[in-house]
Interface confidence: low
């Protein structure tokens, strides 16, 4: 359905509050370095313009596309060339090339200072003084640091952020009420950002066929009672929503997401028995709830898959008639029977099945050729099962911090060329899989672990793409989306790597170590550990453990000393010398 004015259409559909929030997010994700006040000014100008179009859709410029309107607005920023360099060249292009150009300049690792949380009283005063500005600042700060954050979901986070302050700034103990809520929002926000980044990478690097396959598998696990046609409809709609959001079309994305939530709630009976409690909630909460809904129970009477996909003489005929539909049905049928498998494993099985049919349907006796295809899935299934088992055992044995350290060593040996901050960030997040997944029952471990690892490894791929340093990382990231994790798992010590020269400065520490939070201390120690492995890639576990134990003892000793800085100055060189000797 075409509208005379797209901007008026979206303003009316979304309402002023959501419209303004989404435009602010869009601008902040594109121009990540611009000051808050500049963005607020631009958003207000766009909003005033939208209102004139609502009043008269035939008014001047109201017929322009949203990309044209928003792009023209972004290109009015006076300091574009000084602040963004070559991104300013985007403004010389016409749509749609201009928007593509802006998208290509989104920075996954912007050079922005870490967000510092002010005192609770300071935050509560700011909240009460100007609630609207306070919440806009939240949207702006999150969006510019996470340029692919799922915009309608960010509005939901902002609503929760507002609710936390509204409740806790009235409480007797404001800090006890507020801080845990803010910690939870921060952690959930980082996780949400990383999950969305994988969806966008899947669409942008591997195409919508890859995303649709992922969605078929995931939705079939969630809605095993739904018919294939119903799942296909949801997949088509979901793909449109995420394509729009990943492409910077945030108003369309939010609007279509609301339509999808409405459709799901109107058709619960043919989708899932678990949707009811979501559908009673207001829009933002409803969409979030539907996205996170637990798997419905599997129908009790599902027949064996073998009849249709192995034993039938019509397999090749059905495959030839509509390859993607037949493979989609196979994936749907397999996924709805296996909530205990990771989505990535299900996609590997579908790929394997496709490869077998491609080969066997050209053979003299196709049926004989593909008769044992399900047996051949076994190694693909066992590989992630064994990986989860081994790593959960290691996690239970070591605890989270030491498990992270084991992964730091493992991944630094695999890809020592990768920057130390990236190795620390990625390995720490890989290590969080233990606490997140290992406590779950057996049937939930693999989907939790492998699909979480896919999200974390995508972060490595995204950061590495910005500054490529390792052919191995490029290969694992680009060859196959579904085999990324097995590809990284298969990497061993990089024998070609020339060890990094020892730099005493890297291992020089000061009294500021003592005032760091526990997490910050861990990051410092883990940074040192990565540097040690880069210096001595063939160091044994025992050698590295010895050095790290010495490090902990050295820091503890100096932090207890009266003159801490003098202690670090005196003990530091001793620690360095002892470490070099231990690793010789």
């Amino acid at each position: 359905d075409t509208h005379k004015s797209e901007v008026a259409h979206r303003f009316k559909d979304l309402g002023e509050e959501h419209f303004k929030g989404l435009v602010l997010v869009a601008f902040s994700q594109y121009l990540q370095q611009c000051p808050f006040e500049e963005h607020v000014k631009l958003v207000n100008e766009v909003t005033e313009f939208a209102k004139t179009c609502v009043a008269d859709e035939s008014a001047e410029n109201c017929d322009k596309s949203l990309h044209t309107l928003f792009g023209d607005k972004l290109c009015t920023v006076a300091t574009l060339r000084e602040t963004y360099g070559e991104m300013a060249d985007c403004c010389a292009k016409q749509e749609p090339e201009r928007n593509e150009c802006f998208l290509q300049h989104k920075d996954d690792n912007p050079n922005l200072p870490p967000l510092v949380r002010p005192e609770v009283d300071v935050m509560c005063t700011a909240f009460h003084d100007n609630e609207a500005t306070f919440l806009k600042k939240y949207l702006y700060e999150v969006a510019r640091r996470h340029p692919y954050f799922y915009a309608p979901e960010l509005l939901f986070f902002a609503a929760r952020y507002k609710a936390a302050f509204a409740e806790c700034c009235q409480a007797a103990d404001k800090a006890a009420c507020l801080l845990p809520k803010l910690d939870e929002l921060r952690d959930e926000g980082k996780a949400s950002s990383a999950k969305q980044r994988l969806k966008c990478a899947s669409l942008q690097k591997f195409g919508d066929r890859a995303f649709k396959a992922w969605a078929v598998a995931r939705l079939s696990q969630k809605f095993p009672k739904a018919e294939f046609a119903e799942v296909s409809k949801l997949v088509t709609d979901l793909t449109k929503v995420h394509t729009e959001c990943c492409h910077g079309d945030l108003l369309e994305c939010a609007d279509d997401r609301a339509d999808l939530a409405k459709y799901m709630c109107e058709n619960q009976d043919s989708i899932s028995s678990k949707l009811k409690e979501c559908c009673d909630k207001p829009l933002l909460e409803k969409s979030h709830c539907l996205a996170e809904v637990e798997n419905d129970e599997m129908p009790a009477d599902l027949p064996s898959l073998a009849a249709d996909y192995v034993e039938s003489k019509d397999v090749c005929k059905n495959y030839a008639e509509a390859k993607d539909v037949f493979l989609g049905m196979f994936l749907y049928e397999y996924a709805r029977r296996h909530p205990d498998y990771s989505v990535m494993l299900l996609l590997r099985l579908a790929k394997a099945y496709e490869a077998t049919l491609e080969k066997c349907c050209a053979a003299a006796d196709p049926h004989e050729c593909y008769a044992k295809v399900f047996d051949e899935f076994q190694p693909l299934v066992e590989e992630p099962q064994n990986l989860v088992k081994q790593n959960c055992e290691l996690f239970e044995q070591l605890g989270e911090y030491k498990f992270q350290n084991a992964l730091l060593v493992r991944y630094t040996k695999k890809v020592p060329q990768v920057s130390t901050p990236t190795l620390v960030e990625v390995s720490r997040n890989l290590g969080k899989v233990g606490a997140k997944c290992c406590k779950l029952p057996e049937a939930k471990r693999m989907p939790c672990a492998e699909d979480y690892l896919s999200v974390v490894l995508n972060r490595l791929c995204v950061l590495h793409e910005k500054t490529p340093v390792s052919e191995k990382v490029t290969k694992c990231c680009t060859e196959s989306l579904v085999n990324r994790r097995p590809c990284f798992s298969a990497l061993e010590l990089d024998e070609a790597y020339v060890p990094k020269a020892f730099n005493a400065e890297t291992f020089t520490f000061h009294a500021d170590m003592c005032t760091l939070s526990e997490k910050e201390k861990q990051v410092k120690k883990q940074t040192a550990l990565v540097e040690l492995v880069k210096h001595k890639p063939k160091a044994t576990k025992e050698q590295l453990k010895g050095v790290m134990d010495n490090f902990a003892a050295f820091v503890e000793k100096c932090c207890k000393a009266d003159d801490k800085e003098a202690c670090f100055a005196e003990e530091g060189p001793k620690f360095v010398a002892a470490s070099q000797a231990a690793l010789a």
């Epitope: 590997r348 080969k359 190694p379 693909l380 298969a490 024998e495």
Partner: nanobody, 123 residues
Framework: EVQLLESGGGLVQPGGSLRLSCAAS????????IGWFRQAPGKEREGVSC????????NYADSVKGRFTISRDNSKNTVYLQMNSLKPEDTAVYYC????????????????WGQGTQVTVSS
């Protein structure tokens, strides 16, 4: 029963060529990376070449680069190692091995092994 069977070995003069085959039975090679290894008398088994399950990724030991070529024909469930410009130091028993999806850089990373085929380069 899962089996890998090497063939194509033999006696060849320096500068000559051989084509080794690794045929799988009991499972489909589509889902496996295949590595070729060799072991000379009194020496460690060493990696020669490997091809990932997709066929898109191959790697070679420095000592054979430019002389050996690995390829696969999934329709025949077979992987080949074309060996040209053979040298006496290529003399060894050649083994093929399979690992799920991706090449490994260590011997213990492989799940299935063949029995080996002898290659002798001598004048």
């Amino acid at each position: 029963e899962v089996q890998l069977l090497e063939s194509g070995g033999g006696l060849v003069q320096p500068g000559g060529s051989l084509r080794l085959s690794c045929a799988a039975s009991g499972f489909t090679l589509d889902y496996y990376a295949i590595g070729w290894f060799r072991q000379a008398p009194g020496k460690e088994r060493e990696g020669v070449s490997c091809i990932a399950s997709s066929g898109g990724s191959t790697n070679y030991a420095d000592s054979v680069k430019g002389r050996f070529t690995i390829s696969r024909d999934n329709s025949k469930n077979t992987v080949y190692l074309q060996m040209n410009s053979l040298k006496p130091e290529d003399t060894a028993v050649y083994y093929c091995a399979a690992a799920v999806l991706e090449c490994r850089t260590v011997v213990r990373g492989y799940d299935y092994w063949g029995q080996g085929t002898q290659v002798t380069v001598s004048s």
